[in-house]
Amino acid sequence: IWELKKDVYVVELDWYPDAPGEMVVLTCDTPEEDGITWTLDQSSEVLGSGKTLTIQVKEFGDAGQYTCHKGGEVLSHSLLLLHKKEDGIWSTDILKDQKEPKNKTFLRCEAKNYSGRFTCWWLTTISTDLTFSVKSSRGSSDPQGVTCGAATLSAERVRGDNKEYEYSVECQEDSACPAAEESLPIEVMVDAVHKLKYENYTSSFFIRDIIKPDPPKNLQLKPLKNSRQVEVSWEYPDTWSTPHSYFSLTFCVQVQGKSKREKKDRVFTDKTSATVICRKNASISVRAQDRYYSSSWSEWASVPCS
Amino acid sequence: RAVPGGSSPAWTQCQQLSQKLCTLAWSAHPLVGHMDLREEGDEETTNDVPHIQCGDGCDPQGLRDNSQFCLQRIHQGLIFYEKLLGSDIFTGEPSLLPDSPVGQLHASLLGLSQLLQPEGHHWETQQIPSLSPSQPWQRLLLRFKILRSLQAFVAVAARVFAHGAATLSP
C-alpha cells in the first residue's frame, strides 16, 4: 500500500481467482484513543472499533472511503483504491490502446517546435467518475523540472456504438535548451482513477522525436506568363522555432487531381517557393518537416489550382 | 577552417557535408520498421557518447559570441563517431549489407572532421570507451543505438553549419 495523495491510498493486488489479497491496517488520524468506530462509504454498518482497523482487501467491494468516527463526529477519512496486477502485468483498463506507432501506446505526445513545450493526449470510453493527474520530468535518476497543466477533455467522438473521449495536457520544460542535443528523455506519468480503480501510464521520448511542425502558412500561387506553370510560395509557420537559418525546415509540394486515383506529382525543396504545373481542378499542397531530423511531417496546407 | 588562430571554418562546405551526413545517417537507420530505442531511464547509455550540450555554445547566440567552443565540441563528436563506425561493432559479425551506407557515413564523418581541423592543429578529443569484444547480438543492438544517437548529433551540427553559412560567413 502507498499514498497517492493526502488520505488516498493505493493497494496493489495480484488479481486471480481466490487470491489472498492484501492485509491493510488503517489508523485514525486523531489524538483520541477510545470510542472510535469505522464505516465504509455511505454505509452505517460499523466495521470495527479502535484507533486502528485491520482489513483484508481482496476485491473492489473492499475498497472505498473508510471513515473513523467518535460520537457521531467524523475524525478522518482514508480512501482506498485498487491497482490490479494480472499475470504479473498491471491492468490497463481505463485508457484505450492507440496502437500508433506501436501496440500498447496509451499516451501520444507532439511538439510544434523545440521550445520544450509539448502536448500529450489519450483516449478512453469512460465518461464519468474519472480523474487524471499528470507529472513529467527530464530524466529519471536526477530529474529536471517539467511543468504540466491539468488534463482536460479535448474531444468527443462516436466510434460505432461507443463514444470515445480524448483528454489532453500541455507541459513545458522549465529550463529548455532548444539548440542542445537531448541526451535524457522526457518522462511523462499519468495517474488515472476510475471509481475505485487506479492505473498509471508512462511515456518516454525526446522532444526531437515528437516534433510535428504546424503546416506552412500564407500558401500562395502566382501564375507564370504564357505557361501552365505556377510559382507556389509559402512561409514558415509562426509556431516554428527561430531563427530559421538555424532551425530550418524542408518542404514537400504536391499537385493532386480531383480524383484520389490520379497520379500525384511531388517536389521536395528547402526553399519557400517552387514552380509546378497546375492542372485543371487540381489542388496544390505543401507540408513541412525538420530539415535535419526525420520527425513527423506537418499536416498539408492546400490551395486550389483555379 | 578552425585553425589555431581561431579563424572561421569553411562554413558553406561544412554545411553541405553536414547535411549529407544527416541524409546518410537516416538512410543507414531509417526510423520506419525499427524498434524504438528511446529506452526508459537509459541514462547510462547516453553517457557513452558525446552530446552537444546547453553550455557548449552551439546556439545562435553562442556561435555569434565565439564559435570555437562549439566547433571543438562538434569535432570531438565527429572523431568519436568516426572511431565507433570503424570499430568491431560495425566491422564484425553480423556483416553489414553490401549496399549499406555506413561506409559512406564513416568517410563523411572523417571528411567533416578534417575540414574542421587541418593537419598540424590538435584539439583534445573525447576518450572513446574501451570497447570489449562485443557479441554478435550486442553489435546488432549497438549499431542501432549508435546510429540513432548519431542522427541527433549530426542534426545539431548541421543546424550550426547552416546558421554559420547564413550569418557568419565572411
Epitope: - | 524498434m35 528511446r38 529506452e39 537509459d42 557518447v49 553480423p94 570507451p129 570489449s132 546488432l140
Partner: antibody, heavy 121, light 115 residues
C-alpha cells in the same frame, strides 16, 4: 516498473517436452536482447541461451544445443524456451533475464523470479 | 577445466573485508575481459553488483553501495570482488561472469558467510 514473469514450469517425465514463457512489462521489450539462465537445486547459475532484440540471432550453451529453442514474440512482449528431450539433469529453476547493452559493457539488469522445472519419472 | 573458477565458500566477520576471487582458465587473459559480479540471496534471483576491467573502465550497479568494488590480480589471472565493512545482509552467493565465445559464462559461485 520493469517486470519479468516466467511461467510454464512443472513436473515432466524424461524425454518429454515443456515450453516456458517469460512475460515482460514496463519497458520496450523489442529494444533488448533476452536470455535464459538456470540453477539446479543447491547449485550455481548456468547460462543457457540468448536471443537478439529482433530475434535474428540465437546462441545456446553446449548442454542444451539441439534440444532447446529460444524464441520471442515482440508483439506480445514474451520470450519463450521450448525444451525437448528433457533429462533429469535439466531439473532447475529457470530464469529469464534482460540484457542491458551499452558501449561500455553489457550485463543482466533485470531477472524474473524463476519457474521450477522438475524432470522425474 | 572450467572457464571461471571461484572458491566454493568464504567466511568473514562483520566489519571486516572479504576478497572473493574469480580465476580465469589459462589461455584466457584476465586483462582483456570485463568481469561482472552478481549477488544472490536465498529464494531470490541474482542481482547485478558491478563490472570491472580497469580503474578507468568500471561501473557500479544502480543502488549498489561503494563498499562493493572490483579489481584484478594479473599475476593470478583473476578478477576480485572486494567487500569492505561487511554487514550481515552481505551474506549471500556471489557469481562472477564474462562474455566469452558468443556466450555468457558464470563462475561456480562463492557462498559468503558473515560470522
Amino acid at each position: 516498473q520493469v517486470q519479468l514473469v516466467e511461467s510454464g514450469g512443472g513436473v515432466v517425465q524424461p524425454g518429454r517436452s515443456l515450453r516456458l514463457s517469460c512475460a515482460a512489462s514496463g519497458f520496450t521489450f523489442s529494444s533488448y536482447a533476452m536470455h535464459w539462465v538456470r540453477q539446479a537445486p543447491g547449485k550455481g547459475l548456468e547460462w543457457l541461451s540468448v536471443i537478439s532484440h529482433d530475434g535474428s540471432i540465437k546462441y545456446y550453451a553446449d548442454s542444451v544445443k539441439g534440444r532447446f529453442t529460444i524464441s520471442r514474440d515482440n508483439s506480445k512482449n514474451t520470450l519463450y524456451l521450448q525444451m525437448n528431450s528433457l533429462r533429469a539433469e535439466d531439473t532447475a529453476v529457470y530464469y529469464c533475464a534482460r540484457e542491458r547493452t551499452t558501449l561500455s559493457g553489457s550485463y543482466f539488469d533485470y531477472w524474473g523470479q524463476g519457474t521450477l522445472v522438475t524432470v522425474s519419472s | 577445466q572450467a572457464v571461471l573458477t571461484q572458491p566454493s565458500s568464504l567466511s568473514a566477520s562483520p566489519g571486516a573485508s572479504a576478497s572473493l576471487t574469480c580465476t580465469l582458465r589459462s589461455g584466457i587473459n584476465v586483462g582483456t575481459y570485463r568481469i561482472y559480479w552478481y549477488q544472490q540471496k536465498p529464494g531470490s534471483p541474482p542481482q547485478y553488483l558491478l563490472r570491472y576491467k580497469s580503474d578507468s573502465d568500471k561501473q557500479q550497479g544502480s543502488g549498489v553501495p561503494s563498499r562493493f568494488s572490483g579489481s584484478k590480480d594479473a599475476s593470478a589471472n583473476a578478477g576480485i570482488l572486494l567487500i569492505s565493512g561487511l554487514q550481515s545482509e552481505d551474506e549471500a552467493d556471489y557469481y562472477c561472469m564474462i562474455w566469452h565465445s558468443s556466450a555468457s559464462v558464470f563462475g561456480g559461485g562463492t557462498k559468503l558467510t558473515v560470522l
